[in-house]
């Protein structure tokens, strides 16, 4: 899997999970989240050559098309596969609220 | 939706469905498919600026992060959303076979 266990240990130009820490206040301008101050969002990036981690039949055909026709510009793209939620603490007035924000953390990637 | 109805009618630099006809023999080197000779596979391409058809909470956050930090390289990517199957006719010896290949045709796109 193109996850942290593999991608953070290997220098990889191809599609892989990349580390990204987002500070809510500095990076997003969000002052309303009390905890955490930021989180490891991560992101997916890198080339999708030669059937690298192809996700669907279409991405496999597209990858094959690109492999055979290298001048083509219709290549698959490196995107998130598995995502996890993030639990945050914020306040409405003086009332603390705990919320789980879905699909906030990327855990693995694919070529799609 | 970033589908043919919208994308094929508008000149769009942002993420959109793009037409791509694949000729099985010429483009993939496949001689074994009897019918069809090729098909409209289509593909997704284009930029994913702030909130352009963002797919998940993470792609929305990433999009916002990129807007606030334009030097960042962690942008969402334009990929397939809805896919459809393709029915093919081929032969095993002299016996005709009809097969439905799943996820062969892209119908719409998203920023993920």
């Amino acid at each position: 899997a193109l996850d942290a266990a593999y991608c953070f240990r290997n220098v990889q130009d191809n599609c892989c999970l990349r580390p990204l820490y987002i500070d809510f206040k500095r990076d997003l301008g969000w002052k309303w989240i009390h905890e955490p101050k930021g989180y490891n969002a991560n992101f997916c990036a890198g080339a999708c050559p030669y059937l690298w981690s192809s996700d669907t039949q279409h991405s496999r055909v597209l990858s094959l098309y690109n492999t055979i026709n290298p001048e083509a510009s219709a290549s698959p793209c490196c995107v998130s596969q598995d995502l996890e939620p993030l639990t945050i603490l914020y306040y409405i007035g003086k009332t603390p609220k705990i919320e789980q924000l879905s699909n906030m953390i990327v855990k693995s990637c694919k070529c799609s | 939706a970033l589908d043919a109805a919208y994308c094929f009618r508008n000149v769009q630099d942002n993420c959109c469905l793009r037409p791509l006809y694949i000729d099985f023999k010429r483009d993939l080197g496949w001689k074994w498919i009897h019918e069809p000779k090729g098909y409209n596979a289509n593909f997704c391409a284009g930029a994913c600026p702030y909130l352009w058809s963002s797919d998940t909470q993470h792609s929305r956050v990433l999009s916002l992060y990129n807007t606030i930090n334009p030097e960042a390289s962690a942008s969402p990517c334009c990929v397939s959303q809805d896919l459809e199957p393709l029915t093919i006719l081929y032969y095993i010896g002299k016996t005709p076979k009809i097969e439905q290949l799943s996820n062969m045709i892209v119908k719409s796109c998203k920023c993920s």
Epitope: L64, I68 | K25, L28, G29, W30, W32, Y90, E99, S102
Partner: nanobody, 114 residues
Framework: QVQLVESGGGLVQPGGSLRLSCAAS????????MGWFRQAPGKQREMVAI??????SYVDSVKGRFTISRDNAKNTLALQMNSLKPEDTAVYFC?????????WGPGTQVTVSS
Amino acid sequence: QVQLVESGGGLVQPGGSLRLSCAASGSIFGVFYMGWFRQAPGKQREMVAISTDDRTSYVDSVKGRFTISRDNAKNTLALQMNSLKPEDTAVYFCNLNQLGTDYWGPGTQVTVSS
């Protein structure tokens, strides 16, 4: 069900040659592609070369050194590897994609070392 078995791996010195073979058995039809992939320790499996009915393609790092060939009558796939380099060291896998389903052989070890 398709079965694949590779052979021809071994230890070779840098600059040397090896020929890998793959025998496919079972009902072979609707082949998207047949190919050779490799996996070095701690790395992802990567494509080396693929063959469709009348096209071949190679990863950049092996172009001009490796040649893939297919014998449809015998259901075999071969990979002629010349001018081998230490970075070619890996387990090499034969792959057949039939109507979108991948079939893999168990792999054969290729070690390039002096």
